[in-house]
Interface confidence: medium
């Protein structure tokens, strides 16, 4: 498994990571940590594991956390209610 660096699928990344789109170069995917408490997230990035190619910069939130709206267009990983 690729622990850090370029990837194509989640299966190439280590535990607690997903293969997300690079913030710097949109055509590249890199192994990225799952969302921690307070991290920004996207509400539809929640397929774990995902067998396709992710389209977002963020990974799903860690287990026990949910991607919740805090303002009109801002979502962060928060403890599940």
């Amino acid at each position: 498994a690729v622990i850090t660096g370029a990837c194509d699928k989640d299966s190439q990344c280590g535990g607690g990571m997903c293969c997300a789109v690079s913030i710097w170069v949109k055509s590249i995917r890199i192994c990225t940590p799952m969302g921690k408490l307070g991290d920004s997230c996207h509400p539809l990035t929640r397929k774990v594991p995902f067998f396709g190619r992710r389209m977002h910069h963020t990974c799903p939130c860690l287990p026990g956390l949910a991607c919740l709206r805090t303002s009109f267009n801002r979502f962060i990983c928060l403890a599940q209610k």
Epitope: T45, K47, F51, R53, M55
Partner: antibody, heavy 121, light 111 residues
Framework: EVQLVQSGAEVKKPGASVKVSCKAS????????MHWVRQAPGQGLEWIGY????????TYNQKFKGRVTITVDKSTSTAYLELSSLRSEDTAVYYC??????????????WGQGTLVTVSS | DIVMTQSPDSLAVSLGERATINCKAS??????????MNWYQQKPGQPPKLLIY???NLESGVPDRFSGSGSGTDFTLTISSLQAEDVAVYYC?????????FGQGTKVEIK
């Protein structure tokens, strides 16, 4: 060839439950999510929810929450939609549709033939 | 819920002419520069068929006379040269936020 084959038409009384099946073949079942969509006679499309065929995680349209249950049987590559407390407005064709795996685009690239559920007293 | 409104409800176009269908979302369906909008075609007695995903990406096997464009709240499906087999109802669908919602449909007929 990808195929989604659904169970046959059902006629139910108001207040009853119905369970529709969708048997998948031609691809790795657990690698794709499965959506359910319905279409009332002469009307448009309404998304009900979807399930991860890998781990069974579900996301439902809140409109149906508490009445709908989506499950999978990995051993038979079959997805199920159960709808309870049926009312006349639930009369519709119910479709299963495979998620495309185009990132998080949630497009539905293969569809079952549809199952007509009629709710009538 | 995000409300999708299509226009027109129906249109009649001559064979070989351009058909244009519009879809307006009640709020933006963009994220990170991508537009989370799909288009489907449904012929009578058949299930829907995916034409366009993520606003402008042509599904495999779909003729290139179909194209999608737009961003934010306003999207368009264009059939550059209408063929007899394109007679159908067309639906837009947003997938940026659940519940994933569809437009009411646009019926395309031959003039």
């Amino acid at each position: 060839e990808v195929q989604l084959v659904q169970s046959g038409a059902e006629v139910k009384k108001p207040g009853a439950s119905v369970k529709v099946s969708c048997k998948a073949s031609g691809y790795s079942f657990t690698d794709y999510d499965m959506h359910w969509v319905r279409q009332a006679p002469g009307q448009g499309l309404e998304w009900i929810g979807y399930i991860s065929c890998y781990n069974g995680a579900t996301t439902y349209n809140q409109k149906f929450k508490g009445r709908v249950t989506i499950t999978v049987d990995k051993s038979t590559s079959t997805a199920y939609l159960e709808l309870s407390s049926l009312r006349s407005e639930d009369t519709a064709v119910y479709y299963c549709a495979r998620d495309s795996n185009y990132g998080e685009a949630y497009a539905m690239d293969y569809w079952g033939q549809g199952t007509l559920v009629t709710v009538s007293s | 819920d995000i409300v999708m409104t299509q226009s027109p409800d129906s249109l009649a176009v001559s064979l070989g002419e351009r058909a244009t269908i519009n879809c307006k979302a009640s709020q933006s369906v963009d994220y990170d520069g991508d537009s989370y909008m799909n288009w489907y075609q449904q012929k009578p007695g058949q299930p829907p068929k995916l034409l366009i995903y993520a606003a402008s990406n042509l599904e495999s096997g779909v003729p290139d006379r179909f194209s999608g464009s737009g961003s934010g709240t306003d999207f368009t499906l264009t059939i550059s040269s209408l063929q007899a087999e394109d007679v159908a109802v067309y639906y837009c669908q947003q997938i940026n936020e659940d519940p994933f919602t569809f437009g009411q449909g646009t019926k395309v007929e031959i003039k």
